[in-house]
């Protein structure tokens, strides 16, 4: 990545990390509006199985780990990139390494859930506050999941999916932070493993992942009011340990492996329409990346 | 019937290549982790490399990292080893081997084995 | 990277004898250890898995424990197609190691 001045634009896509035969530093900017993409700095250290968020306009890259032809190391790093300055900066790390993490913000508090440190598979979630720079334990979830989709909705964090060791998963359950307590939700139709989860108009929506056999190209969607899981369209590419995120009331996922090829392609789903179209290709293919939008 | 069998050994120059394949049936390879193990002539076991069929990242042993490549391909259910820049410590007798479970990441179905040879 | 310090290298035992192999982790590798018998010319086979579990298939006179970073393959009673070679493995930690091998041989 370039380390000059990132311009001054409005909401983008931002894509941090990766794999693609190693970990990668890459951090990229899809801009929807002009379909261009930027070359941003580069992350201090490599990783994958990361996630992204952003809050208060500055994006964050929690856990991953770093596979490289060095070795293989499981991060507990939380790195803060601010869009205005185009650099990145080291905030407290997590109490334990967290690959293949998923991540959800309530109330401007970052929540890192689950992920995996060798072969040990938390069910630990962490809470981090951003003016503190500080990071506590809350509640652990019912289930241990690595490759975990998670979601905010209505100050509800969603855990959908993943992998226990065992098992890949069609399990869910919400985190309640007035109480700090999980509790499961209704299953998906599908087992998933390293899908993408995002909120979109009220439904949790769960696309591609893992079964244990193949790569997936379903997508379903919870609606909270009536507790069900719904199928809707399906993506055009079979998918896992792809990237989600949802920027003017559509969703978009990038990247992913789909069981023979590291996938560049980005689609793009029309909840209006109930529709996929590809929009646009990342620069490589990759899997495993980070992914969120810039706030206004 | 779960079975592996390896090909593609044989003798080879030191600073040559070799491409190592493992045929599965009765299971999908996409189901699975697949391993390299080798051993050398009279000594132990030594994992060399692995692939992980959720998300395609692979791991290597130091001892072969940038010169060896594992790869798979689901529509043949085979895995393959490519073996570049061979040195005379890379003989031995190569293994693949099916992950029993990610968590126990133990190998319950091991192929019969292929001798790669490397020597002027 | 981890150490798998197998013990003896090598034993000489009759049938029917209680044989007992220790690997000794350098660090704590958890549960996540199996163990392997290899015969001659042939590919190793799954025993123990998560330290203490028994493979699907396999006699019942095998058994693995653990205590800290110290792992036991105990077999109560040995068979004469129990004579070969016994490897521990640790996947605990990148990279997975084995330990050196325990050769079982004919009193």
């Known amino acids: 990545g370039s380390m000059g001045h990132a311009p001054k634009v409005g909401r983008l896509i931002y894509t941090a990390g990766g794999y693609f035969r190693q970990s990668l530093s890459y951090l990229e900017a899809y801009n929807p509006s002009d379909g261009t993409w930027l070359d941003l700095a580069d992350l201090q250290v490599p990783r994958s199985g990361l996630a992204g968020c952003v809050v208060g306009g500055l994006l964050y890259a929690v856990g991953g780990r770093n596979n490289s032809p060095d070795g293989n190391t499981d991060s507990s790093a939380l790195d803060c990139y601010n869009p205005m300055t185009n650099q990145w900066s080291p905030c407290a790390p997590m109490s334990v390494p967290r690959n293949r993490i998923g991540v959800g913000v309530i109330d401007g508090h970052i929540y890192a859930v689950g992920g995996s440190h060798g072969c040990i598979h938390h069910n630990s979630v962490e809470r981090y506050e951003p003016e503190r720079d500080e990071w506590h334990l809350v509640a652990p979830m019912l289930t241990r999941r690595i490759g975990v989709g998670v979601a905010v909705l209505n100050r509800l964090l969603y855990a959908v999916g993943g992998f226990d060791g065992t098992n890949r998963l069609n399990s869910a359950e919400c985190y309640y932070p007035e109480r700090n307590e999980w509790r499961m939700i209704t299953a998906m139709n599908t087992i998933r493993s390293g899908a993408g989860v995002c909120v979109l108009h009220n439904c949790i929506y769960a696309a591609g992942g893992y079964d244990g056999q193949d790569q997936l190209n379903s997508v379903e969607r919870y609606d909270v009011e009536t507790e069900t899981w719904t199928f809707v369209a399906p993506m055009k590419h079979r998918r896992s340990a792809l990237g989600i995120t949802v920027h003017q009331g559509r969703i978009y996922v990038l990247g992913g492996y789909d069981g023979h090829t590291f996938l560049d392609s980005v689609e793009c789903y029309d909840p209006d329409t109930d529709t996929w179209s590809e929009v646009t290709r990342m620069t490589s293919g990759r899997s495993g990346v980070g992914v969120a939008v810039t706030m206004e | 019937e779960v079975q592996l069998v390896e090909s593609g050994g044989g003798l080879v120059q030191p600073g040559g290549s070799l491409r190592l394949s493992c045929a599965a049936s009765g299971f999908a390879i996409s189901a699975s982790s697949i391993h390299w193990v080798r051993q050398a002539p009279g000594k132990g076991l030594e994992w060399v490399a692995s692939?992980?069929?959720?998300?395609?990242?692979?791991l290597y042993a130091k001892s072969v990292a940038g010169r060896f490549t594992i790869s798979a391909d689901t529509s043949k259910n085979t895995a393959y080893l490519q073996m570049n820049s061979l040195r005379a410590e890379d003989t031995a007798v190569y293994y693949c081997?099916?992950?029993?479970?990610?968590?126990?990441?133990?190998?319950?179905?091991w192929g019969q084995g292929t001798l790669v040879t490397v020597s002027s | 990277d981890i150490q798998m310090t197998q013990s003896p290298s090598s034993l000489s035992a009759s049938v029917g004898d209680r044989v007992t192999i220790t690997c000794r982790a350098s660090?704590?590798?958890?549960?996540?250890v199996a163990w392997y018998q290899q015969k001659p010319g042939k590919a190793p086979k799954l025993l123990i898995y998560s330290a203490s579990s028994l493979y699907s298939g396999v006699p019942s006179r095998f058994s693995g424990s653990r205590s800290g970073t110290d792992f036991t393959l105990t077999i109560s009673s040995l068979q004469p197609e129990d004579f070969a070679t016994y490897y521990c493995q640790q996947s605990y930690s990148f990279p997975s190691t084995f330990g050196q091998g325990t050769k079982v041989e004919i009193k």
């Open positions: 660090q704590s590798v958890s549960s996540a």
């Open positions: 081997a099916r992950e029993y479970a990610w968590w126990y990441a133990a190998a319950d179905y």
């Open positions: 692939i992980d069929p959720e998300t395609g990242e692979t």
